[in-house]
């Protein structure tokens, strides 16, 4: 038997420095977690202790903090090289700055293979990108070889900016011939490494003949066997075992997100490359693991440019700004309220005595809120903090919608409530009541909106045939997170200001903020 240790990360999203437990900016260093310096310590410890070790990343290193805003991917290549990653799969966010923003900083600079079997370059891009990413790579590990085959969410063209000369094929369709090719090269230990989410990871394990292990990302899935060490609730055991169509037991793993954990999987293979056993658990990278001093020094050196860019205080918060997905994708969160209030404030235009303002309503997909802000840092809010909350560089736009469209949007907001999906809406100038005991599509039992044609603003029931102005992210105006009805039915769409700028301006104007959870979103008795 031959034993392989797979160390893996996914959805690190620009968390190069250690973070607080909720993956926002580190406040109290003694309680902080993750970061590449700490990750390196643990990886090196395992490399010294065990003979056959692979360090893999399943995509979405890009996008998430000021590190990416400023360094645009150069930081990813530099520190992944320093940690000596063995391979990486492309995630959807690797395309956020277009193909050029992937090629120049990362593909050309990475000293490790970057993989995706289901992305095909065509036209004039084919020669430009040739050899810079690969469908698979055969890696020597000890006396053996291991094949790593990559995959990327086929939704990427609708989630990011890959341009028109990359085609995203169905993952299973694309993976099978590459795995078959590896088999003909006498590679009998094959890992599928990719970024399509846990459901697709399990399907790959079930359907792709010859894949021995699946290491995934995209869905931020936390798997754990036993008592979990932090706040994350496991979606299943680690590894999650899938029985393939040809009767094999295939371990599937993922390691949550934000570099908080290092996935640790030990696989035992027989001489024919069959998996005999698999066990392990994600390792919580907490402060009991010291940060490697040389990597830490390098981080501090790279930090200087960020400090100049972003550390000026915009204003203060005297309350915790809850931007966690556990809150903002399930219920009213005060970070959502803050952002919506900023969006309305940014659109104050006193028109005449009949109207106090031309727009009173805001909607915001909870999935677009990517981080909380801890007030225990002297209350300081910086651009850097806001870049972690709103990392996607979108705009807050003005649209005109019929009441009936808004009703559909709010039904969509909770049509699959409870799965931590991004479409749950945060609001401003709206009071909504949901009854989750009713069937999807019929869960909005009350929807009141703030009047605009009034001298004293008050909440009135939404009228289906009336046309309303609403401020929302451009992502929603373009039908993102499944809000197709907004894109299809909007009557007018005007582009607005950069999202972080809107919020930073508001905070600077207010100087001290204390947003509350105040009953904008309610659940009727017995359903929540």
């Amino acid at each position: 038997a031959w034993e392989l240790t797979i160390l893996h990360t996914n959805d690190v999203h620009s968390r190069l420095e250690q973070t607080s437990e909720d993956s926002s900016k580190c406040v109290n260093a003694s309680r902080c977690m993750g970061g590449v310096a700490r990750l390196f310590t643990k990886v090196q410890q395992i490399r010294r202790a065990e003979p056959n070790v692979l360090l893999l990343d399943a995509g979405d290193q890009y996008q998430g903090t000021i590190w990416f805003t400023v360094y645009k991917g150069a930081e990813v290549a530099h520190f992944m090289n320093a940690l000596r990653y063995d391979a990486m799969a492309l995630g959807n966010h690797e395309f956020d700055n277009g193909v050029e923003g992937l090629i120049e900083p990362l593909l050309k600079e990475a000293k490790f293979p970057i993989l995706s079997a289901n992305i095909k370059a065509k036209g004039p891009l084919a020669s430009q990108i040739s050899g810079l990413y690969l469908p698979y790579k055969v890696l020597p590990v000890g006396d053996e070889v291991v094949g790593i085959v990559g995959y990327t969410s086929k939704e990427t063209p609708f989630l990011s900016n890959p341009g028109t000369n990359l085609v995203f094929e169905d993952e299973i369709t694309a993976l099978q011939p590459e795995v078959d090719k590896l088999k003909t090269l006498n590679v009998n230990k094959i890992i599928a490494l990719g970024h399509s989410g846990f459901e697709m990871d399990k399907l790959i394990a079930q359907k792709v003949r010859g894949v021995d292990v699946v290491v995934g990302g995209h869905s931020n899935t936390f798997l754990y066997t036993g008592n979990p060490p932090s706040k994350e609730v496991p979606a299943g055991k680690y590894p999650f075992i899938v029985t393939s169509d040809d009767g094999r037991k295939v371990p599937v793993v993922q390691a949550y997100a934000f570099g908080k954990y290092l996935g640790y999987l030990k696989i035992e293979f027989d001489e024919r490359g069959n998996v005999i056993s698999s066990h392990g658990n994600p390792i919580l990278l907490n402060s009991s693991i010291p940060e490697d001093p040389s990597i830490k020094a390098d981080i501090n050196k790279w930090r200087i440019k960020l400090d100049n860019y972003s550390t000026q205080e915009l204003g203060k918060t005297i309350v915790y700004l809850d931007g966690s997905s556990q809150s903002c994708r399930f219920r009213e969160c005060n970070m959502g309220n803050l952002i919506c209030d900023a969006m309305i404030n940014n659109n104050l235009r006193h028109t005449d005595e009949m109207f106090w303002n031309h727009v009173s309503m805001c909607i915001l997909n909870g999935g677009g809120i990517r981080s909380p802000i801890d007030e225990r840092n002297n209350g300081t809010i910086t651009w850097e903090n806001l870049a972690a909350v709103l990392p996607f560089g979108g705009t807050f736009d003005l649209v005109q919608l019929k009441g009936s469209t808004l009703k559909k949007a709010f039904e969509h907001s909770v049509h699959r409530y409870g799965q931590s999906t991004g479409e749950f809406l945060q609001v401003g100038g709206i009071h909504v009541v949901y009854d989750l005991s009713r069937k999807p599509g019929d869960r909005v039992v009350k929807l009141d909106v703030l009047c605009t044609k009034c001298r004293v603003p008050s909440y009135d029931p939404l009228k289906m045939d009336e046309v309303y102005k609403v401020i929302l992210p451009n992502f929603l105006a373009n039908g993102g997170d499944g809000f197709q009805m907004i894109k299809d039915e909007l009557l007018r769409h005007d582009s607005g200001d950069q999202d972080i700028n809107v919020v930073s301006t508001y905070i600077s104007k207010m100087k001290v903020i204390y947003p509350a959870v105040e009953g904008r979103i309610k659940f009727s008795t017995g359903s929540h």
Partner: antibody, heavy 119, light 108 residues
């Protein structure tokens, strides 16, 4: 001037295979993806698949996997499509079409090759 | 897979008239839609791509519009050479490039 010159009409027996050629001229052959399209009874257009001459990458419509195989000969700037195990359902006009510079639409088409499968 | 539905399947119009052909996608395809014209016994020819960009040499009486799932091709002041079949096609993101079923435009 961009031109795509396809091979002539073919009459073949059921069960046979055949190869259609598409010779490109007037542009850099390796810089553009070549697509193949089927048109039955002068009506529906169906995308079969494409090949990127630079790297030989192919993608097929699932419906035509196992039926069509596309290849290129870079030295002669020619694209080929092999059609296998022919039946009367395969009787159609087949077009090669160059993909536009920024992807997916077809800016130049061959004149078409008519295939008749009949015993 | 994305399906493209064209309407009407056929229409007849007179020279000088304005006609509109519509194309519906089964899901959001943003602005990645092309239109082709095909005359009897000839190859299709690209008219419009990215919903509204006219291909080289295409007269300005042709115009495309729409986004998301609903698209249309408008031909102002029909000319005798405009009669034939028109096809829409989705051209991005997915390896499938589906065509609509076609619209036959005949002289009244």
């Amino acid at each position: 001037e961009v031109q795509l010159q396809q091979s002539g009409p073919e009459l073949v027996k059921p069960g046979a295979s055949m190869k259609i050629s598409c010779k490109a001229s007037g542009y850099s052959f390796t810089g553009y993806t070549m697509n193949w399209v089927k048109q039955s009874h002068g009506k529906n257009l169906e995308w079969i698949g494409f090949i990127t001459p630079y790297n030989g990458d192919t993608i097929y419509n699932q419906k035509f996997k196992g039926k069509a195989t596309v290849t290129v000969d870079k030295s002669s700037s020619t694209a080929y499509m092999d059609l296998l195990s022919l039946t009367s359902e395969d009787s159609a006009v087949y077009y090669c079409a160059r993909e536009g510079y920024d992807g997916g639409y077809f800016d130049y088409w061959g004149q078409g090759t008519t295939l008749t499968v009949s015993s | 897979d994305i399906q493209m539905t064209q309407s009407p399947a056929s229409l007849s119009a007179s020279v000088g008239e304005t006609v509109t052909i519509t194309c519906r996608a089964s899901e959001n395809i943003y602005s990645y839609l092309a239109w082709y014209q095909q005359k009897q016994g000839k190859s299709p020819q690209l008219l419009v791509y990215n919903t509204q960009t006219l291909a080289e040499g295409v007269p300005s009486r042709f115009s495309g519009s729409g986004s998301g799932t609903q698209f249309s091709l408008k031909i102002n002041s029909l000319q005798p050479e405009d009669f034939g079949s028109y096809y829409c096609q989705h051209h991005y993101g997915t390896p499938m490039y589906p065509f609509g079923g076609g619209t036959k435009l005949e002289i009244k």
